[in-house]
Amino acid sequence: YFGKLESKLSVIRNLNDQVLFIDQGNRPLFEDMTDSDCRDNAPRTIFIISMYKDSQPRGMAVTISVKCEKISTLSCENKIISFKEMNPPDNIKDTKSDIIFFQRSVPGHDNKMQFESSSYEGYFLACEKERDLFKLILKKEDELGDRSIMFTVQNED
């Protein structure tokens, strides 16, 4: 069971300091941006991180949403990352959900975060280069010191 708590607005970056944004095709991508680029590209660079109370404490349970025309929420259904047009729900009556991730700091580095899927144990949000694009993907990872699964989250509110 997950019960919604508060939400915050955040900019998410990979460890190469590229900014996560949602492109015109609703794809989550990373790109080099100056702070002014990041502001100019809002709201596509501003993510709503909603925190949830978890009936089995396993870290901070969160959803990641973005509000362009409508609110879309990050999902890892079938291990594929996509934004689905939906509001983060107030309650989820299950111990797993394709839209819930556990946000945890990397040991010894409070500013570096990992996001583990609640649906797929050992699968993490990751940045992966595909041709010329840096994509947000779900990655099965047993190399937990891999920088591709680490992010910084900067609160904007």
Epitope: P57, G59, P107, G122, K140, L144, D146
Partner: antibody, heavy 126, light 107 residues
Framework: QVQLVQSGAEVKKPGASVKVSCKVS????????FHWVRQAPGKGLEWMGR????????KYAERFKDRVTMTEDTSTDTAYMELSSLRSEDTAVYYC???????????????????WGQGTLVTVSS | DIQMTQSPSSVSASVGDRVTITCLAS??????LTWYQQKPGKAPKLLIY???KLQDGVPSRFSGSGSGTDYTLTISSLQPEDFATYYC?????????FGQGTKLEIK
């Protein structure tokens, strides 16, 4: 309690290949990997590589990647490690071990080699 | 590759002594470090994971500490069954690398 049972000792000639098996007995959760570690007589532990039973993907240590093949048979819960072009310095005890997530009180994951096989002595001698 | 430098390579001690073994990583390994005990002719046995978390069933005289690149295994009061070889292992990045081992012998 998970147990790993390895195949018996082998004596091989230089240039030959050896295939060591590792069978899981007992209840094991999903989301584990098999790793192989070797230990030459009187020496330390050396990581050789790992296989993911879910998709058979492998990661090998650079020094073994041209000679080692790790496979897994999900139907029998058995992992295999084959080492080719054997030389005398490959004489060692070869261990299989499971690599699984342990968690701390906040749910943070740590991968751990928890269950180990009894070891298989491979002797390479002409 | 991440190098793990373990010291000392051997140590002589008596029952009841306090013993400390260190492992130095060549880069930050984010506490993804485990400690193993190995007795002659046996497979290694997990003692500590995540740098400081005691594996179930391991006596509380064993403890681990450290972060970043520096890690320590401490045995607070040596018992006869503790004489063995100890290894650290970094699990942060592939290839996984072990320390060279510390042989703990009876003085």
């Amino acid at each position: 309690q998970v147990q790993l049972v390895q195949s018996g000792a082998e004596v091989k000639k230089p240039g030959a290949s050896v295939k060591v098996s590792c069978k899981v007995s007992g209840e094991i959760s999903t989301g584990y990997y098999f790793h192989w570690v070797r230990q030459a007589p009187g020496k330390g532990l050396e990581w050789m590589g790992r296989i993911d039973p879910e998709d058979d993907s492998t990661k090998y240590a650079e020094r073994f990647k041209d000679r080692v093949t790790m496979t897994e048979d999900t139907s029998t819960d058995t992992a295999y490690m084959e080492l080719s072009s054997l030389r005398s310095e490959d004489t060692a005890v070869y261990y299989c071990t499971t690599w699984r997530i342990y968690r701390d009180s906040s749910g943070r994951p740590f991968y751990v080699m928890d269950a180990w096989g009894q070891g298989t002595l491979v002797t390479v001698s002409s | 590759d991440i190098q793990m430098t373990q010291s000392p390579s051997s140590v002589s001690a008596s029952v009841g002594d306090r013993v400390t073994i260190t492992c130095l990583a060549s880069e930050d390994i984010y506490t993804y470090l485990t400690w193993y005990q190995q007795k002659p002719g046996k497979a290694p046995k997990l003692l500590i994971y995540g740098a400081n978390k005691l594996q179930d069933g391991v006596p509380s005289r064993f403890s681990g500490s450290g972060s970043g690149t520096d890690y320590t295994l401490t045995i607070s009061s040596l018992q006869p069954e503790d004489f063995a070889t100890y290894y650290c292992l970094q699990g942060s990045k592939f290839p996984l690398t072990f320390g060279q081992g510390t042989k703990l012998e009876i003085k």
